[in-house]
């Protein structure tokens, strides 16, 4: 009888674990959907505002090829930095290549010096994988140096010419990025 009760208890516990996993997956999926929705809104806002503006990038933004970059003069934690970029119809910087990284670090050297700037890179809590905000993985040469010993969520930032990692709840400058307006001439 006791063995039967113990077996039932174990089965119930197993069921509970499965349900918790399902809930966790659903929460992640929901978060991902919400983020993609924000991306679409940012993209739309960018397209609409660009339509009324003839220059490829807004004032105080830097252009490089098809991208416009904004280097903040304010400090935020990583999540607030992302929200700040979204308000501007942009997203936190996503570095696609070494060439882009070199452009960013070169520009930072000229305007600000050796400060920390959040970019759109964060570590997935479950898998430990690094992901850009659109869900893609960074190329092998653009993985942050494992500097953070934080037990909290870890996010990526640029300093000097390096990509580093840190607790997402610390205050740093940040860099936003959006598409440059194509000339209609």
């Amino acid at each position: 009888k006791l063995l039967q009760v113990s077996t039932i208890a174990m089965q119930q516990q197993e069921k509970l674990i499965q349900q918790e996993r399902a809930l966790l997956n659903f929460t992640e999926w929901k978060r991902s959907c919400a983020l993609q929705m924000k991306y679409c809104q940012a993209f739309m806002q960018n397209s609409l505002s660009s339509a009324h503006n003839s220059s490829p990038c807004p004032n105080n933004w830097i252009q490089n090829r098809e991208s416009c970059y904004y280097v903040s003069e304010i400090w935020s934690i990583w999540h607030t930095s992302q929200e700040n970029c979204l308000k501007e119809g942009s997203t936190l910087l996503q570095i696609e290549s070494k060439e882009e990284m070199d452009f960013i670090t070169g520009s930072l050297r000229k305007i600000k010096g050796s400060y920390d700037y959040w970019v759109g890179l964060s570590q997935d809590g479950h898998s430990g994988r690094w992901l850009w905000q659109d869900g893609s993985s960074p190329s092998p040469g653009l993985l942050p140096a494992e500097r953070s010993q934080s037990a909290n969520q870890v996010c990526g930032y640029v300093k000097s010419n390096s990509l580093l990692s840190s607790n997402c709840s610390t205050w740093k400058y940040f860099i936003c990025e959006k598409y440059a307006l194509r000339s209609s001439v």
Partner: nanobody, 126 residues
Framework: QVQLQESGGGLVQAGGSLRLSCEAS????????MAWFRQAPGKERDLVAA????????EYHDSVKGRFTISRDNTKNTVYLQMNSLKAEDTAVYYC???????????????????PGQGTQVTVSS
């Protein structure tokens, strides 16, 4: 944009006191939160203390609770940080910061964005 001018930093013996001041200009001072951050070499930037626009709400880093007091004088556009019982681990550059308009709700200092000042060095010798 806000301009911030810190003063009051310096060298002090462990157990001693210092009072940092920060004068703000360029915006109506009494409408936004103010804070003090600090950064020691090789360490992350920490929020030491913050105060709401009215002075009605304050927040302190665990390591300074009971030793540091943040206050503001809206008639003088100035925020203060009174630091008592200073320890060697309080050595850092201290930055005054002004809340970015509309970035935080009353008392929600962690969700806010901040305009930083230039910083003032505080060194505590043991």
């Amino acid at each position: 944009q806000v301009q911030l001018q810190e003063s009051g930093g310096g060298l002090v013996q462990a157990g001693g006191s210092l009072r940092l001041s920060c004068e703000a200009s360029g915006r109506t001072f009494s409408t936004y939160a103010m804070a003090w951050f600090r950064q020691a070499p090789g360490k992350e930037r920490d929020l030491v203390a913050a105060i709401s626009w009215s002075g009605g709400s304050t927040e302190y880093h665990d390591s300074v609770k009971g030793r540091f007091t943040i206050s503001r004088d809206n008639t003088k556009n100035t925020v203060y940080l009174q630091m008592n019982s200073l320890k060697a681990e309080d050595t850092a550059v201290y930055y005054c910061a002004a809340e970015v308009e509309g970035s935080g709700r009353e008392g929600n200092f962690y969700g806010a964005s901040w305009y930083p000042g230039q910083g003032t060095q505080v060194t505590v010798s043991s």
